[in-house]
Amino acid sequence: FKVATPYSLYVCPEGQNVTLTCRLLGPVDKGHDVTFYKTWYRSSRGEVQTCSERRPIRNLTFQDLHLHHGGHQAANTSHDLAQRHGLESASDHHGNFSITMRNLTLLDSGLYCCLVVEIRHHHSEHRVHGAMELQVQTGKDAPSNCVVYPSSSQDSENITAA
């Protein structure tokens, strides 16, 4: 399977909410011995290997924000910790998974990574990620609502397997 990032850049005004999205593509094993670990984190723009560094989002680590479920099942973070930080991660039946960030400020600007780990019990892991940029703008240059820029077809199916 692959991870697609439908949008490579989100440009939002301060105070707005944004939902960053990734999508699982390709055949997904729905066997009872397969589970999916999905999460989000920030990373450094300057890295040679994108998304190799895992930094917190609003002080919450990728462990705090993870979803753990089988196949194309729906799930979302319901714990108070994430919601107190204005964050919610979710996953639907169609392979889409997302993180919603509320009341954006300039300090939320950065590179965001989604990570999917397919865990086969007693066997190996398959790990892929996607990356997207969030730019939060202030002042007269800022848009009135979030503007999203589609990934190129090559970028949108950018996969990194470990």
Epitope: R45, G46, H85, G110, L111, Q137, D141
Partner: antibody
Framework: QVQLQESGPGLVKPSETLSLTCTVS????????VHWIRQPPGKGLEWIGV???????DYNAAFISRVTISVDTSKNQFSLKLSSVTAADTAVYYC?????????????WGQGTTVTVSS | DIVMTQTPLSLSVTPGQPASISCRAS??????????MQWYLQKPGQPPQLLIY???NVKSGVPDRFSGSGSGTDFTLKISRVEAEDVGVYYC?????????FGQGTKLEIK
């Protein structure tokens, strides 16, 4: 190695426009914000404004009516323009790179360029 | 604007002795648990150099005699044993809100 170097005329006449350039090397212009900060003689540091990696800008309200910060990616240069200058704009002007992937701080500064406003 | 107030504005310290500088912000510089507060040292004739970021993280290459602490509005820079090379002006700076603002500076001299 990350480097920033300011350049521009050392002397500007009152009411004219001060134009400075910050030439950078060792990092991608699309990966960091570049700020302009000034220091009047014998005084503290004053933040003027920033151009972020996406090209948008934020300015100190004290300068907003007369300041423009821009980037020329083909030349790896950032520029500061400050119009209608007075003697109070005499200062050392610095450009500084900001590491804002997570912790927001000025990690590398230029050496500064001295600008005197006088007729 | 967030106003940064440093105390003292100057201090004279004997080599080997400790030194402490305080910085108070007019409002909190916290963002979801991270204090967006930095400390810089400006040596004579040089641009400022980063010592501490996010209140307590010592920049790589900075001697471990420097440390930072605090959260919310009150922050402290400590030098455990002052050395001759530590002379200069120390500035605190916040990155919580535009405009980024600096303290007035604290001049450290050696006795």
């Amino acid at each position: 190695q990350v480097q920033l170097q300011e350049s521009g005329p050392g002397l500007v006449k009152p009411s004219e426009t001060l134009s400075l350039t910050c030439t950078v090397s060792g990092f991608s212009l699309t990966s960091s914000g570049v700020h302009w900060i000034r220091q009047p003689p014998g005084k503290g540091l004053e933040w003027i404004g920033v151009i972020w990696s996406g090209g948008n800008t934020d300015y100190n309200a004290a300068f907003i009516s007369r300041v423009t910060i821009s980037v020329d990616t083909s030349k790896n240069q950032f520029s500061l323009k400050l119009s209608s200058v007075t003697a109070a704009d005499t200062a050392v002007y610095y450009c500084a790179r900001e590491d804002y992937d997570y912790d927001w701080y000025f990690d590398v500064w230029g050496q500064g360029t001295t600008v005197t406003v006088s007729s | 604007d967030i106003v940064m107030t440093q105390t003292p504005l100057s201090l004279s310290v004997t080599p080997g002795q400790p030194a402490s500088i305080s910085c108070r912000a007019s409002e909190s510089v916290e963002y979801y648990g991270t204090s967006l507060m930095q400390w810089y040292l400006q040596k004579p004739g040089q641009p400022p150099q980063l010592l501490i970021y996010a209140a307590s993280n010592v920049k790589s290459g900075v001697p471990d005699r420097f440390s930072g602490s605090g959260s919310g509005t009150d922050f402290t820079l400590k030098i455990s044993r002052v050395e001759a090379e530590d002379v200069g002006v120390y500035y605190c700076q916040q990155s919580r809100k535009v405009p980024w603002t600096f303290g007035q500076g604290t001049k450290l001299e050696i006795k």
